[in-house]
């Protein structure tokens, strides 16, 4: 550590550059100032992201990878710092930026939404899972009629371009479907999606967005839901959804609807069975849905309800007449 009476002058890093290394991904690089007097001290660097979203952090190395949207441009600064228990010395900032890509903002797509879904891979002898990706968007309000949009995703080091589009009445792509992707259903990386475009009339502004998998992963409904009535006991059982997550990773909701009187019972469970006491001769429809529990992943979406299964008596007759 520095002694209080020692003086050192900190100089800003040099050759600070921002390189786009992938879809929604940049590499910040710099070099220590060659005129910096080292004097056996541990220099660090403070990186500040100015746009599109403010952030700052410290690092000892001279590069930093950043996952960020780029359609609004990107701006960052870095400075040399030296800190001990009670004081901080800092140089001035070195800054760099990427300008927003060409094209007016109204030409880029809006309302980009994506969902992932897991299926079992039938081509593999071992049990493995395949993740599909479906994205939809709306055409930009200022986009010329001849605009065509193209979608790409990046997950980790894998980048793919969409091959299956849905089109609007003018033939413009407005949705994309990847039946198989490189997305890992239990992965924790960001999913980056980019939609760029072209037109003979004007530049089309690209649009990129980052998605957290837990927030867009559409869980499958539970499998093989069964229900039976024995006297006044309604017993319901089911199996975990098709998913790469193991059996202990699911929360369930059971919905029991008495179709005679409209009464609805919803129970939240962590097991794959439920018994309810029923008190009259009615027909019940039973459904179950699933979500990955917070033990295994951040809270996400519930699955769709399983198809209703009907149990009980459906006769339209008075119950216990005088």
């Amino acid at each position: 550590d520095l002694l209080p009476d020692e003086k050192i002058s900190l100089l800003p890093p040099v050759n600070f550059t921002i390189k786009v290394t992938g879809l929604a991904q940049v590499l910040l690089q710099w070099k220590p100032n060659p005129d910096q007097e080292q004097r056996n001290v541990n220099l660090e660097y403070q990186v500040k992201i100015n746009a599109p979203k403010e952030d700052d952090y410290e690092t000892r190395i001279t590069e930093s990878k950043c996952v960020t949207i780029l359609h609004k441009g990107f701006s960052a600064s870095v400075r040399t710092i030296l800190q001990n228990d009670h004081s901080l010395l800092a140089s001035s900032w070195a800054s760099a930026e990427l300008h927003a890509p060409p094209g007016s903002p109204g030409t880029s797509i809006v309302n980009l939404t994506c969902t992932t879904n897991t299926t079992e891979d039938n081509y593999s002898r071992l049990r493995s899972y395949q993740v599909s990706l479906h994205c939809t968007w709306l055409v930009g309000t200022d986009a010329p009629e001849d605009t065509q949009y193209f979608l790409y995703y990046r997950y980790g080091s894998w980048t793919e371009e969409c091959q299956e589009y849905s089109k609007d009445t003018l033939g413009r792509n407005i949705a994309c479907w990847f039946p198989r992707t490189f997305i890992l259903s239990k992965g924790r990386d960001w999913l980056a999606v980019l939609v760029n475009g072209s037109s003979k009339h004007s530049a089309i502004r690209p649009f990129d967005q980052l998605f957290a998998l837990h927030a867009i992963d559409q869980i499958n409904p539970p499998l093989n839901v069964t229900a039976e009535i024995e006297g006044t006991r309604l017993s319901i059982q089911w199996e975990k959804p098709v998913s790469a997550f193991p059996i202990h990773c699911f929360d369930y909701e059971v919905k029991i609807h008495n179709t005679r009187n409209g009464y609805l019972q919803i129970e939240k469970l962590m097991t794959n069975a439920f018994i309810s006491i029923i008190d009259d001769l009615s027909k019940y429809d039973v459904q179950v849905r699933a979500a990955v529990s917070s033990m295994c992943r951040e809270a996400g979406l519930w699955s769709e309800w399983s198809q209703p299964i009907y149990v009980g008596n459906d006769e339209h007759k008075p119950l216990r007449e005088w």
Epitope: H257, N261, G262, Y263, L264, I266, D314, H316, K317, W322
Partner: antibody
Framework: EVQLVESGGGLVQPGGSLRLSCAAS????????MTWVRQAPGKGLEWIGI???????YYASWAKGRFTISRDNSKNTVYLQMNSLRAEDTAVYYC?????????WGQGTLVTVSS | DIQMTQSPSSLSASVGDRVTITCQAS??????LAWYQQKPGKAPKLLIY???TLASGVPSRFSGSGSGTDFTLTISSLQPEDFATYYC????????????FGQGTKLTVL
């Protein structure tokens, strides 16, 4: 004869209260969930609330706090207590029995809220 | 609360005509829908429950179909006594969502 008969309607001033009764005959009310529905003059049907066999009651969002449904199985009767009445509560009030739909209705009782 | 939207709000037809009334729920109510007929000055009468099951004593010219959010009431051949107002009602999860009626369809003589 299996029937429902509402009573207790009439003229009431704004801000006043009224309790409507629905008496069942020909069947045991204790075996059925019951509901109240109203119909303003020249308007459509509007669901008010339901009381289940268990005694639990549920209400349309607009009726919560002002309207209360109760039942007395020993009297074979269901009640609708209405408080803080307004001019827009003027309507014919029906009770109905639930059995895969509202299969039995009373004849209705008219409530007029006016000063 | 669930909202029920009925169409048309009024309809003119002649005896012998086939008539269709539709009802749309603001969310999935599966097959939990009832249809009622009401004549002036009278209480409503249950026609159909669970979307398609005819209530006791209702003529077979009345039929219901649909599930989920879209439902239809059909009168295959109108009779003079069928001129009335018709209402749909959700019977799904009343304790959660209420039991709203559609706004009604008034069927009159052309």
């Amino acid at each position: 004869e299996v029937q429902l008969v509402e009573s207790g309607g009439g003229l009431v001033q704004p801000g006043g209260s009224l309790r409507l009764s629905c008496a069942a005959s020909g069947f045991s009310l204790s075996s059925y969930d019951m509901t109240w529905v109203r119909q303003a003059p020249g308007k459509g049907l509007e669901w008010i609330g339901i009381i289940y066999v268990s005694g639990s009651a549920y209400y349309a969002s607009w009726a919560k706090g002002r309207f209360t449904i109760s039942r007395d199985n020993s009297k074979n009767t269901v009640y609708l207590q209405m408080n803080s009445l307004r001019a827009e509560d003027t309507a014919v009030y029906y009770c109905a029995r639930i059995n895969y739909g509202l299969d039995l209705w009373g004849q209705g009782t008219l409530v007029t809220v006016s000063s | 609360d669930i909202q029920m939207t009925q169409s048309p709000s009024s309809l003119s037809a002649s005896v012998g005509d086939r008539v269709t009334i539709t009802c749309q729920a603001s969310q999935n109510i599966y097959s939990n829908l009832a249809w009622y007929q009401q004549k002036p000055g009278k209480a409503p009468k249950l026609l159909i429950y669970r979307a398609s099951t005819l209530a006791s004593g209702v003529p077979s010219r009345f039929s219901g179909s649909g599930s989920g959010t879209d439902f239809t009431l059909t009168i295959s051949s109108l009779q003079p006594e069928d001129f009335a107002t018709y209402y749909c009602q959700s019977n799904y999860g009343i304790n959660y969502y209420g039991a709203a009626f559609g706004q009604g369809t008034k069927l009159t003589v052309l």
